[in-house]
């Protein structure tokens, strides 16, 4: 199962902080960075870093503590950029994360200083059983407003 999240400030659920996706083991979380055709918005493109954080970091939208791990950077607003996180109990990669069934994980984005972006937040709730490959509904859309 692949869960697509269009990560941009036109996505009201990310902006409000009430976006929650439920994932099973072996699912994928696909984060789609903001993408602009042509010159982009007048206030400038959104660029930011995405972090996995703890609950206090999620609440305050801060990514500076020892439990705030930088996962990806959306810094190419005129390219098509997507990142994927595999929800797995054990990871073979040193930079991968291990996800436990029944736990909730928190992602936030912190705008880069020159960006027009805002704080965006997502909760990932990991369910119990492993799933076969299929598609799921996306959170937001490329140009959701």
């Amino acid at each position: 199962l692949r869960h697509v999240v269009y990560w941009n400030s036109s996505n009201p659920r990310l902006l409000r902080g009430d976006a929650v996706v439920e994932l099973g083991l072996n699912d994928y979380l696909d984060i789609v960075c903001p993408h602009y055709e042509g010159p982009g918005p007048p206030e400038g493109p959104e660029t930011f870093a995405l972090y996995m954080v703890d609950w206090p970091g999620y609440e305050s939208c801060q990514a500076e503590g020892p439990r705030a791990y930088k996962r990806w950077v959306c810094s190419l607003p005129f390219g098509h950029v997507q990142f994927s996180e595999k929800i797995q109990r054990f990871t073979p990669f040193s930079l991968g994360f291990e996800f436990l069934p029944g736990e909730t994980y928190y992602y936030i984005s912190v705008p880069t200083p020159e960006s027009s972006g805002q704080c965006l937040r997502l909760q990932v709730s990991v369910c119990c059983k492993e799933r076969k490959s299929e598609s799921a509904h996306p959170v937001g859309s490329p140009g959701e407003s």
């Epitope: 609950w55 500076e64 503590g65 020892p66 930088k70």
Partner: antibody, heavy 120, light 112 residues
Framework: QVQLVQSGAEVKKPGASVKVSCKAS????????IHWVRQAPGQGLEWMGW????????KYNERFKGRVTMTTDTSTSTAYMELRSLRSDDTAVYYC?????????????WGQGTSVTVSS | DIVMTQTPLSLSVTPGQPASISCRSS???????????LYWYLQKPGQSPQLLIY???NRFSGVPDRFSGSGSGTDFTLKISRVEAEDVGVYYC?????????FGGGTKVEIK
Amino acid sequence: QVQLVQSGAEVKKPGASVKVSCKASGYTFTGYYIHWVRQAPGQGLEWMGWIYPGNFNTKYNERFKGRVTMTTDTSTSTAYMELRSLRSDDTAVYYCAREDGSPYYAMDYWGQGTSVTVSS
Amino acid sequence: DIVMTQTPLSLSVTPGQPASISCRSSQSLVHSNGNTFLYWYLQKPGQSPQLLIYRVSNRFSGVPDRFSGSGSGTDFTLKISRVEAEDVGVYYCFQATHVPWTFGGGTKVEIK
């Protein structure tokens, strides 16, 4: 003012369990991590793990995994650390400590310590 | 696990003289978020540890300005510009960048 008051000294036999308490006051208990650190006689400090009372999340030092359980009772603002299958080398002073948030992310207040002696 | 190596093991200092303690980590302590979670604690005889320096170089509230921290990557230093009698005890460096969080072995400071 912030205070962490720990339970009294314990003497245990090998194979037994011990449960040390740490009562917090002077701050919002659910908003700060609690850590447990131990110190064997004449030795240095060893980090055992943390618990976040706001959602009961824990992280344990792998060295203690399977033997340690950290819990909290938010109604009494008390943190607990239980260590099972005690061995003689678990003889130590056990400290609880509060971790402050931004910008410190440091253990800023510590309990007075609880002496645990494991002896047959 | 990250190994934190402190030198020297012990230090005997004349009051008013400077002292320096080194701490070296087996891996860089720069976190993926760009911060460095390196701390210094002092444990006075018969007491619980107390925080001196947080995140490499920031003095905790109430800590005298004769204490200073510096360093980056894997090499860190605690300096006491003028040692006083109340500074005796064991000094520990501590890292919270990599789990498990680990302490150095300690440096015992005594007064000559």
